[in-house]
């Protein structure tokens, strides 16, 4: 009888992650009596997958019954199959010895490929705001993907974006691999509902890239314009000055209105209202009495957005212009939500 | 249902022959190392011989030259021819089928008794 | 040729107790050991291959272990069916050889 052959018959086998893996082996002889075995890798550190002999392999079942003795085919699957799985494996045939078996003959391996989908890109902005005609980075980062080849692109607002780096690691041979891309991006002031989006295309997604996104409106601010003007009298002894805060973002907005450089009020913007490009507007109205100041008085509309340093506006208010009433300094009416009298 | 049937045991003089047949049923007995086993009465179990699945054949240091072990694969039948027979081969003779890979023993025939007197 | 040696040669024992039977081989064996149960005017019938594995079809009160040279037959609560003789066996190398039996008997 001619000498026993271990065929594995698959060079590799590419299974996807989750699935079975099947890997096939015949051997051309009954003899020498003694086990088969499947390892995955070769050389003293490879790894026990199977023993006809003893043992317990839980995801490992045959193909065929091996209580038959006339069976020659010692054909595996593997369930579940993860990444971590990926290797060649070798289907090995053992003379029954002691004191341990003797390795008789080997297959010539199958290589196990996995593929195995990237996880859903997660895209981050820079830790603080940053303020229009900046540069900011964004980063995506998607794991767990095999094989290596993987594309990544970067879109605002539906336009690619070419000022980007990326790497996948390792760089050398893995089970699984990584990718870390970071995207810079000019702001504009018009960026408020503009999206960074962060695609990445993989053979296991079959033409159903993954997208990862970030809104610029958790990275952008948008500072106000302030302006302060002097509307028409009410009374003969009333100005109403107003503080227009326009195209601000974020909300977060206090206002405090200065006489001559002393605080006169402090507000917090809650009734805005909202432009088609996502910033804020808000108007103070100040009601002042003229008639209760001799001089000239500085108004002065100063704004705090979001913890920054301070912007002001600043209106003279010439009280010469206006003629007074002697000993009147009754409280003008109050008539907006936002006004407030000086005296 | 696999089963092992020994026949051809009997009395027999010093020097005589005999020939032991063990016919198999519900498995392909050449796919199987087989063997013989004996047992005298009272006393413990022996290996006799046994064929590998290449023909090859093994024996027992008592029986060697005397005794020989075959299978015909037509008949999925065992045999074992006995000459030269002495007293001290008298014992049951069993037919046992080889494990699956490692050769151990699973199915055991219910025996043949063979009497060697004058 | 292997000797192989079992202890005791018998043993008296009760329905429900546990006993150990042991085996040992004159060199390494690997696991190539067989146990196996006979009764009288009956043919063996085997329990155990490759040191621990069952055949199939026998209860799991048997369980054997061992390596080497050494090797033990544990059963784990008698009942009137296991008083019998029990026989160990090398078959890593011919001749296969036996070990003598221990006779195990009703206390």
């Known amino acids: 009888e001619e000498e026993l052959q271990v065929i594995q018959p698959d060079k590799s086998v590419l299974v996807a992650a989750g699935e079975t893996a099947t890997l096939r082996c015949t051997a051309t002889s009954l003899i020498p009596v003694g086990p088969i075995q499947w390892f995955r890798g070769a050389g003293p550190g490879r790894e026990l997958i199977y023993n006809q002999k003893e043992g317990h392999f839980p995801r490992v079942t045959t193909v065929s019954d091996l209580t038959k003795r006339e069976n020659m085919d010692f054909s595996i699957r593997i369930g579940n199959i993860t990444p971590a799985d990926a290797g060649t494996y070798y289907c090995v045939k053992f003379r029954k010895g002691s004191p341990d078996d003797v390795e008789f003959k080997s297959g010539a391996g199958t290589e196990l490929s996995v593929r195995a989908k990237p996880s859903a890109p997660v895209v981050s902005g820079p830790a603080a705001r940053a303020t229009p005609q900046h540069t900011v980075s964004f980063t995506c980062e998607s794991h767990g993907f095999s094989p290596r080849d993987i594309t990544l692109k970067w879109f605002k607002n539906g336009n690619e974006l070419s000022d980007f780096q990326t790497n996948v690691d390792p760089v050398g041979e893995s089970v699984s691999y990584s990718i870390h891309s970071t995207a810079k991006v000019v702001l504009t002031r018009e960026d408020v509902h503009s999206q960074v989006i962060c695609e990445v295309a993989h053979v296991t997604l079959q033409g159903d890239p993954l997208r990862g996104t970030a809104n610029l409106s958790e990275t952008i601010r948008v500072p106000p314009t302030l302006e302060v003007t002097q509307q028409p009298v009410r009374a003969e002894n009333q100005v109403n000055v107003t503080c227009q805060v326009r195209k601000f973002y974020p909300q977060r907005l206090q206002l405090t209105w200065l006489e001559n450089g002393n605080v006169s009020r402090t507000e917090t913007a809650s009734t805005v209202t909202e432009n088609k490009d996502g910033t804020y507007n808000w108007m103070s109205w100040l009601l002042v009495n003229v008639s209760a100041h001799r001089d000239d008085v500085k108004l002065t509309c100063q704004v705090e957005h979001d913890g920054q340093p301070a912007v002001s506006k600043s209106h003279d208010l010439k009280v010469s212009a206006h003629p007074k009433e002697q000993g009147s300094n009754t409280a003008a009416e109050n008539t907006g939500s936002n006004e407030r009298n000086i005296y | 249902e696999v089963q092992l049937v020994e026949s051809g045991g009997g009395l027999v003089q010093p020097g005589g022959s005999l020939r032991l047949s063990c016919a198999a049923s519900?498995?392909?007995?050449?796919?199987?190392?087989m063997h013989w086993v004996r047992q005298a009465t009272g006393k413990g179990l022996e290996w006799v011989s046994a064929?590998?699945?290449?023909?090859?054949?093994y024996y027992t240091g008592s029986v060697k030259g005397r005794f020989t072990i075959s299978r015909e694969n037509a008949k999925n039948s065992l045999y074992l021819q006995m000459n030269s027979l002495r007293a001290g081969d008298t014992a049951v003779y069993y037919c046992?089928?080889?494990?699956?890979?490692?050769?151990?023993?699973?199915?055991w025939g219910q025996g043949t008794m063979v009497t060697v007197s004058s | 040729d292997i000797q192989m040696t079992q202890s005791p040669s018998s043993l008296s024992a009760s329905v429900g107790d546990r006993v150990t039977i042991t085996c040992r081989a004159s060199?390494?064996?690997?696991?190539?050991l067989a146990w196996f149960q006979q009764k009288p005017g009956k043919a063996p019938k085997s329990l155990i291959y490759?040191?621990?594995s069952l055949h199939s079809g026998v209860p799991s009160k048997f369980s054997g272990s061992g390596s080497g040279t050494d090797f033990t037959l544990t059963i784990s609560s008698l009942q009137p069916e296991d008083f019998a003789t029990y026989y160990c066996?090398?078959?890593?190398?011919?001749?296969?050889?036996f070990g003598q039996g221990t006779k195990l008997e009703i206390k």
């Open positions: 046992v089928r080889g494990g699956v890979w490692d050769d151990a023993f699973d199915i």
């Open positions: 519900g498995f392909t007995l050449s796919s199987y190392d």
């Open positions: 064929i590998g699945t290449a023909g090859d054949t």
């Open positions: 060199q390494d064996i690997n696991n190539y």
């Open positions: 490759t040191a621990s």
């Open positions: 066996q090398q078959y890593v190398s011919y001749p296969y050889t």
